[in-house]
């Protein structure tokens, strides 16, 4: 994906993220030279968070609320750089891109990983899922690959039908673009595919984190 805009407001932090940050700072003060065993540290953090009272968590929740307000305030005045329009128009009626075999696998096992390791960051959950997938024998991957292939087939039929009808957005604007070469089009679609999957996973994780905060 493109390089981030340095002027873009920093993303908002959850109450748990503030708590972990505080944990890290405490750990650094106590053991300035010690290297952190990430999984042990995450485990301890999440155990501590689970045993904390609502009153103790309150401080971090206040920090998260303040940070959310800061983020919303900054986003109101933030102007994205030229060419970085929020996202190219996506017709909500367009067929949804099919997930890859790995994405199907992740959807199946992400809840388990997140549930058993509540302190793991989104990146580390993804890393763990990647390890699980890589350690999976080829014949164990087959059901996911079969399902992904079926969904891809269905998508290709649906997208062909959708294109035959003509994109409503293009029709409205009267835009007539020369057909890109099939190869280029497919490459772009694959790239978009991966971006969509990553975005969907991030959105899912963010939603789940917010749900966790509500608990």
């Amino acid at each position: 994906m493109g390089k981030g805009d340095p002027k873009k407001p920093r993303g908002k932090m959850s109450s748990y993220a503030f708590f972990v940050q505080t944990c890290r700072e405490e750990h650094k003060k106590k053991h300035p030279d010690a290297s952190v065993n990430f999984s042990e540290f995450s485990k301890k953090c999440s155990e501590r968070w689970k045993t904390m009272s609502a009153k103790e968590k309150g401080k971090f929740e206040d920090m998260a609320k303040a940070d959310k307000a800061r983020y919303e305030r900054e986003m109101k005045t933030y102007i994205p750089p030229k060419g970085e329009t929020k996202k190219k128009f996506k017709d909500p009626n367009a067929p949804k891109r099919p997930p890859s075999a790995f994405f199907l696998f992740c959807s199946e096992y992400r809840p388990k990983i997140k549930g058993e390791h509540p302190g793991l960051s989104i990146g580390d959950v993804a890393k763990k899922l990647g390890e699980m997938w890589n350690n999976t024998a080829a014949d164990d991957k087959q059901p996911y690959e079969k399902k992904a292939a079926k969904l891809k087939e269905k998508y290709e039929k649906d997208i062909a039908a959708y294109r035959a009808k003509g994109k409503p957005d293009a029709a409205k604007k009267g835009v007539v673009k020369a057909e890109k070469s099939k190869k280029k089009k497919e490459e772009e679609e694959d790239e978009e595919d991966e971006e969509d999957e990553e975005e969907e996973e991030d959105e899912e994780d963010e939603d789940e984190e917010e749900d966790d905060d509500d608990e």
Epitope: E108, P111, K112, H117, N135, T136, A137, K147
Partner: antibody
């Protein structure tokens, strides 16, 4: 406390059907793969079938393929095994089991299925 | 399909003695997917060792697992009365699981 409780076993005639259930409690059922393992009298352990957390993916031992169907109802925290065209060799204690992190397996006490005329 | 063969079928030993149980796979398997179970009469199996050599929660230190490729071993350094049981090796495929068990080794009192 994590618990798995099998039920539905009994005496059935060859060619008959039976549906086993396994009620789970004490853990988030919808996160985990679930598995049926059986043990014929005086014999060893035999893996029967497994199902993924969402229920979207299943696997079967060759000996039961086409006759047994594994399913789950995550809203009821229950695992099922529908057994059709039962044979004498399906006589066994059927265990329901799941596996947590670090391979900590949890097993039920088992339910006995007897196929006999 | 991978077959798991255990030997001996029965092991007659006295408390305090050491025990060595063998498990052979019909083709090379990753140690990540090799486990050992203990089963006592009338009880469900209990996981002892996973990933060929890691002790599961609650497994006493006298139990140890080793091996790689096709040959794996479960060792009991000094048998306690509660260790007399049947032991199964297991090869596991995951997501969702598919398990292959050996036929078992019975450890009985001599």
């Amino acid at each position: 406390e994590v618990q798995l409780l099998e039920s539905g076993g009994g005496l059935v005639q060859p060619g008959g059907s039976l549906r086993l259930s396994c009620a789970a409690s004490g853990f988030t059922f919808s996160w985990y793969d679930m598995t049926w393992v059986r043990q014929a009298p005086g014999k060893g352990l035999e893996w029967v079938s497994s199902i993924s957390p969402s229920g979207g993916y299943t696997k079967y031992a060759d000996s039961v393929k086409g006759r047994f169907t594994i399913s789950r109802d995550n809203s009821k925290n229950t695992l099922y095994l529908q057994m059709n065209s039962l044979r004498a060799e399906d006589t066994a204690v059927y265990y329901c089991t799941t596996e947590f992190y670090d391979y900590l397996d949890v097993w039920g006490k088992g339910t006995t299925v007897t196929v006999s005329s | 399909d991978i077959q798991m063969t255990q030997s001996p079928g029965t092991l007659s030993l006295s408390p305090g003695e050491g025990a060595t149980l063998s498990c052979r796979a019909s083709q090379s398997v990753s140690s990540t997917y090799l486990a050992w179970y203990q089963q006592k009469p009338g009880q469900a199996p209990r996981l002892l060792i996973y990933e060929a050599s890691k002790r599961a929660t609650g497994t006493p230190a006298r139990f140890s697992g080793s091996g790689s490729g096709t040959d794996f071993t479960l060792s009991i350094s000094s048998l306690e009365p509660e260790d007399f049981a049947v032991y199964y090796c297991q090869h596991r495929h995951n997501w969702p699981p598919q398990w292959t068990f050996g036929q078992g080794t019975k450890v009985e009192v001599k």
